[in-house]
């Protein structure tokens, strides 16, 4: 569903997008993800902030918690206990890193309509969750884990060694949160709540990144974060499991690390409970091309966890790193020993495999020159997954169902023909036993969320169709979008081109390349967006292009692993190649070509500007990496190896932005960074600026005081206004 295009009769009522539209979020869309609480019931927070329970079978709805109760403690979030006797209410949200935050929690007793008094929770809490059955509570406070059998009970302290920036229990440290798990929690209840598993991260030997936070005080604060950069000492991780029924009986029991992993530096990558007495742990060598999946069983006699070598499954990559961005997680079948998992097949495409005994004997479930992306749910007779198979567009996502009860297994695309023009990029959310599911379509048309019967796939109702957005866009001249591919030297380069509303192939337009280009990323996706680049095309008449080159995902290992140990080479080459092809199309003004990117995209845009091709007149780098020696170990080493002489130090040195300072002389460069960036440290831009000054190269720069990697709030408005002025000046467009 795209708003109707311009007809001559309407032309004077139609208007272009404005920058204000974008900054105000005028054309943002809504999605609807049910908070499933059973096979047929879900919760949803209504527009007026009531918590409403919906029963799909009967069509009835029930307000289980009024907005009055929510407001009484300023709650912005909630969580119903599985026995439906209590609700936690979350307030005083205080963001920390990407996922982590602290909050104050209140427990509301649904049986008497009052808040639980006595043995209240401490504040602020770092993480809190209900057990999967009943109403036990686990929470993390000051880096230690606590357990309550019932909300009104006194807490049982599970760990005692938690210390800020030193020992983290039940929550990840910075690098595990951002690059490995990636979640705000590191504790996992067993399916019926008998056991609680948790990770302990020891950061005592990790070097600390320190930066100033200016605030309003006379003296700036210093933020200290244990942050392992490439080659530095890493966190030491241990996994423990405690019996929550009798927590004091034997205490936490450590789960052994597989011998082949423990022989050198390693990571823990995920934990999956199979049953109450069987758990699956995934481990990864520091050189991230070997992953081990270890299935462990509870020994009642010894009260310990046993991980036999016969239940270790090794996943190894010979051409790159293990997995895609992360090593995939197993989805266990009902027999509680076999599982489904996505990994590379012999042709180098990520596909679903069924592992019963050994990885070598894995049965391949999907195959083809496309990739399986996510396994949503396995039931007794069906497996639901997403892939980009349909019509061979890698930037699409459709949901499929494979029948696993019958032989041969039959495959059905659930979404391919539902709303074919409007919807080509889906995700799904399933109720218990996949009795029902919600589909969330992200585009290319206006997003829509729908509810479906899990047996027949029949649509039951529309959950959110963004009618207001559709109406608001009726008089807007949106740019045209096309997704196509270039074939260059046996490489397929998919691109998205965003064209001005009255695009005319016989005219010449300025071109802006928007790049991310990081390993296992994808920019060319069939999704809806009205954003800054939509405005640049609609109002300012620019052509914008996004190109997925080597190193990007979901098109096979050949493209993905091409950048292994060589970051900053092929990603840049492929952007340049695409620009040359765009020029050949005849509608690009070759004297007005720019490139911009954020984060990894800032790195690529900087290298492209400094490539010496003369293609780019100007460009912008927002919060760029400038040297891989400055970035996090887990991410960087996955793709680059170690910065040591006997490993890959040479390419670490060759791939810096600073090494190309001289080449910025003939381009207009705008460098932007937040001073409180915990992720890509301000250090990166400081070093670029220093190198440019030392080379006596002129450039423009903007810093955002006390802003992190997201440059949010008022900084966002300033940022996009500033970048707009820069580009309009570069392209000689009148203000």
């Amino acid at each position: 569903l795209r708003p109707s295009r311009v007809h001559n009769s309407e032309e004077n009522t139609m208007r272009a997008l404005t920058l204000k539209d974008i900054l105000n979020g005028t054309f943002s869309y809504k999605t609807f993800f049910p908070n499933w609480i059973s096979g047929q019931e879900y919760l949803h927070q209504s527009a007026d902030n009531n918590i409403v329970l919906y029963n799909i079978e009967t069509g009835q709805s029930y307000t289980i918690l009024s907005n009055r109760t929510m407001k009484s403690v300023n709650a912005s979030n909630y969580g119903l206990s599985p026995d439906r006797q209590f609700v936690y209410l979350e307030s005083d949200y205080s963001k920390l890193w990407r996922y982590s935050y602290t909050a104050t929690y209140y427990i509301y007793d649904l049986s008497n309509g009052e808040f639980v008094r006595g043995n209240e929770l401490p504040r602020p809490i770092q993480y809190l969750c209900w057990s999967p059955v009943g109403s036990k509570l686990a929470y993390v406070y000051q880096n230690n884990i606590y357990l309550k059998q019932r909300p009104g009970d006194p807490p049982f302290q599970i760990t005692f060694n938690g210390r800020e920036n030193k020992i983290f229990n039940g929550i990840p440290d910075w690098v595990y949160e951002e690059e490995m798990l990636p979640t705000k929690y590191a504790l996992w209840w067993s399916p019926n709540g008998k056991f609680l598993a948790y990770a302990e991260f020891n950061d005592k030997d990790i070097p600390v990144i320190a930066y100033s936070y200016y605030g309003d005080e006379q003296y700036p604060r210093t933020i200290n974060i244990p942050y392992p950069k490439a080659g530095a000492k890493n966190p030491v991780v241990r996994i423990f499991i405690i019996d929550t029924t009798y927590p004091a009986y034997v205490g936490p029991q450590e789960v052994p690390v597989p011998a082949m992993i423990a022989s050198s530096d390693y990571y823990f990558s995920w934990l999956t409970w199979v049953t109450d007495e069987r758990v699956c742990l995934q481990w990864l060598k520091r050189v991230q091309n070997v992953s081990v999946l270890s299935i462990c069983d509870f020994r009642e006699d010894w009260q310990t966890w046993d991980c036999p070598k016969t239940q270790e499954h090794i996943e190894e990559s010979r051409t790159g790193w293990a997995g895609g961005f992360f090593v995939s997680r197993p989805v266990f079948s009902y027999d509680a020993i076999s599982y489904y998992k996505i990994f590379s097949d012999k042709d180098g495409y990520k596909h679903i495999h069924y592992i019963k005994d050994t990885v070598e004997n894995a049965i391949q479930i999907t195959s083809g020159k496309w990739e399986a992306i996510n396994i949503f749910r396995v039931t007794q007779d069906s497996l639901f997954y997403s892939s980009n198979e349909f019509e061979e567009y890698p930037g699409r996502r459709n949901i499929y169902r494979i029948s696993i009860g019958s032989y041969p297994p039959s495959k059905k695309c659930v979404t391919c023909h539902l709303r074919k023009e409007r919807c080509q990029y889906y995700t799904a959310s399933f109720s218990d036993y996949a009795k029902y599911y919600a589909l969330v379509c992200y585009g290319p048309g206006i997003p829509i969320s729908t509810l479906h019967d899990g047996r027949t796939d029949q649509e039951i109702k529309i959950l959110e169709e963004n009618k207001e957005l559709e109406n608001a866009l009726k008089n807007i001249q949106l740019p045209k979008e096309e997704i196509k591919k270039l074939e260059v030297d046996e490489i397929t380069l998919w691109y998205k081109m965003i064209l001005p509303p009255q695009f005319d192939r016989s005219k010449k337009y300025p071109l802006l390349i928007q790049v991310y280009g990081g390993p296992c990323s994808q920019s060319v996706r069939s999704v809806f967006a009205v954003n800054w680049i939509s405005y640049l095309a609609s109002k300012e008449g620019m052509v914008i292009a996004l190109v997925d080159g080597r190193g990007t995902a979901f098109q096979g290992d050949k493209l993905l692993y091409a950048v292994y140990r060589k970051l900053g080479v092929y990603e840049v080459e492929d952007q340049i190649t695409a620009v040359r092809k765009f020029i050949e199309m005849g509608f690009i003004d070759e004297k007005r070509i720019a490139i911009w990117g954020w984060s990894y995209g800032g790195y690529v845009s900087s290298l492209a500007l400094a490539s010496g091709t003369g293609l780019f007149k100007c460009g912008i780098a927002v919060a760029p990496v400038s040297s891989w020696e400055y970035y996090a170990s887990v991410y960087t080493e996955r793709f680059m190896g170690l910065p040591t002489k006997d490993d890959n130090l040479e390419h670490y040195k060759n791939s810096t932005v600073m090494a190309r300072a001289e080449y910025f002389r003939n381009v207009d460069y705008l460098l932007i960074h937040g001073t409180a960036d915990d992720n890509v440290h301000f250090q990166n831009s400081a070093q670029i600026a220093k190198a440019l000054v030392n080379a006596q190269v002129d450039f423009q720069a903007m810093w955002y005081s006390d802003q992190n990697h997201g440059l949010s709030g008022l900084s966002t408005n300033h940022l996009y206004t500033h970048m707009t002025h820069f580009l309009k000046q570069c392209f000689s467009l009148s203000d």
Epitope: S38, G39, Q40, E41, L53, N55, E57, T58, Q60, Y62, I64, L80, D83, R84, Q85, D109, L110, S111, N112, G113
Partner: nanobody, 123 residues
Amino acid sequence: QVQLQESGGGLVEAEGSLRLSCAASGRTFGSYAMGWFRQAPGKERELVAAISSGGSTLYADSVKGRFTISRDNAKNTVYLQMNSLKPEDTAVYYCAARSGGAYYTARVDWPYWGQGTQVTVSS
């Protein structure tokens, strides 16, 4: 084991009122959550109202403000006062019980049931 017996159903005109009663056997009545369900011909049995052991109530949005559930633990009885009745309220009304929380709307979560009482609202 709880035995339940409904009464108070009948024929009533639109906008009229009825009061349903459900008498329960068993000494631990006070510890059970109690609910009223209804089933119209060809439709699923749906929860109309529920009351927890602590007296907290839950209503279907379609009856909120018109129906009131209450309990008398001394008499082992739960009531459903139905006002401003509409033709679409016509159904067999069932009393149900469960140990634990009241905030369950699926039929399968309520193990104990009465025989039902017919309520007919004429227009």
